[in-house]
């Protein structure tokens, strides 16, 4: 159950309502737990977690990455620039999260939960951001053709793509969480 949708929260009126920052924090933690579960299935199902041929698949991907210039790391930390990067990056990840749907057997619901929780996280962060004009939304047509291209890959590349998406998304979220906790 995503944070804030727990029936126990309703039954505990004495508990302080979550602040916006706490809600974002919990949401990211929830998504990270989901990624962790999905990674377990990926690693159990194939040997992708041990593979050294990642570069082959990485050429097809343009996964969002944090760089020093984005202002999210300790060096050159900039709250506003970083927040824009986090939201932009999450919006760019959405097409890859769509690709992850139907890539899991026993964790199908978990994959859906990660996708839906990310949409909610984006909404939370957009409310927090002051400079929404700086946020570029990915082009739906480009996303559609990327999705088609990824789904047309052979089985090995699809497995590797799944593994790389989870790894990159985990790293992006973890860096985002650290940055948000400094804000």
């Amino acid at each position: 159950v995503p944070p804030g949708e727990d029936s126990k929260d309703v039954a505990a009126p004495h508990r302080q309502p979550l602040t916006s920052s706490e809600r974002i924090d919990k949401q990211i933690r929830y998504i990270l737990d989901g990624i962790s579960a999905l990674r377990k299935e990926t690693c159990n199902k194939s040997n992708m977690c041990e593979s050294s041929k990642e570069a082959l698949a990485e050429n097809n991907l343009n996964l969002p990455k944090m760089a020093e210039k984005d202002g999210c790391f300790q060096s050159g930390f900039n709250e506003e620039t970083c927040l824009v990067k986090i939201i932009t990056g999450l919006l760019e990840f959405e097409v890859y999260l769509e690709y992850l749907q139907n890539r899991f057997e026993s964790s199908e619901e978990q994959a859906r939960a990660v996708q839906m929780s990310t949409k909610v996280l984006i909404q939370f962060l957009q409310k927090k951001a002051k400079n929404l004009d700086a946020i570029t939304t990915p082009d739906p047509t480009t996303n559609a053709s990327l999705l088609t291209k990824l789904q047309a890959q052979n089985q090995w590349l699809q497995d590797m793509t799944t593994h790389l998406i989870l790894r990159s998304f985990k790293e992006f979220l973890q860096s985002s969480l650290r940055a948000l906790r400094q804000m």
């Epitope: 944090m66 999210c72 650290r178 906790r181």
Partner: antibody, heavy 119, light 107 residues
């Protein structure tokens, strides 16, 4: 089995440099943030620096910022700590440690390598 | 930086005793707290993370509790191999900081 093996420690004069290495095995190295944690003789544990899985992001404690550089080579499953302008207060056992998969505790530790800064 | 204060700094107990060590954070850290055990000349070993979650392979006599600023490590029935120094660490925000340890000695 997760293994972290540090090397490169030794005796160095104040102002000198040293490069520590950590060889990792038994896990998918580029899935994890890695760190250096130190412990001066008879003292508390002190986090020194961390690096993200891709190597794109780094974090340092204030007292080493600008003097120490953490880096990694994912192709070699290796972590490094370049230590410049060393001071007496940097004397400690330096441990290589692996962060948790999604959380910032230190799940596995190496046996440590001793760095002594003295004239 | 978040300061972590451990108490007591040392503690004498006997095999079979129930022991409690506390850790106080200078600001709220949610449940982002870990506990480690360290024996002389050895590296620390993770016991508990996320305040309450037991690391794989750690005996169930170890347990953690707390949230926010106040945390506790409990050993329900001390065993001879438990005599060591215990450290808490906040994993909430960098710089990640440790308590200065609680040395558990044989009475």
């Amino acid at each position: 089995e997760v293994q972290l093996v540090e090397s490169g420690g030794g005796l160095v004069q104040p102002g000198g440099s040293l490069r520590l290495s950590c060889a990792a095995s038994g896990f998918t190295f580029n899935d994890y943030d890695m760190a250096w944690v130190r412990q001066a003789p008879g003292k508390c544990l002190e986090w020194v620096a961390s690096i993200t899985p891709s190597g794109g992001g780094t974090y340092y404690r204030d007292s080493v910022k600008g003097r120490f550089t953490i880096s990694r080579d994912n192709a070699k499953n290796s972590l490094y700590l370049q230590m410049n302008s060393l001071r007496a207060e940097d004397t400690a056992v330096y441990y290589c440690a692996r962060h948790g998969y999604t959380l910032d505790y230190f799940e596995y530790w190496g046996q440590g390598t001793m760095v002594t800064v003295s004239s | 930086d978040i300061q972590m204060t451990q108490s007591p700094s040392s503690l004498s107990a006997s095999v079979g005793d129930r022991v409690t060590i506390t850790c106080l954070a200078s600001e709220g850290i949610s449940n982002d707290l870990a506990w480690y055990q360290q024996k002389p000349g050895k590296a620390p070993k993770l016991l508990i993370y996320d305040a309450t979650r037991l690391q794989d392979g750690v005996p169930s006599r170890f347990s953690g509790s707390g949230s926010g600023t106040d945390f506790t490590l409990t050993i329900s029935s001390l065993q001879p191999e438990d005599f060591a120094t215990y450290y808490c660490q906040q994993s909430y925000k960098y710089p990640w900081t440790f308590g200065c340890g609680t040395k558990l000695e044989i009475k």
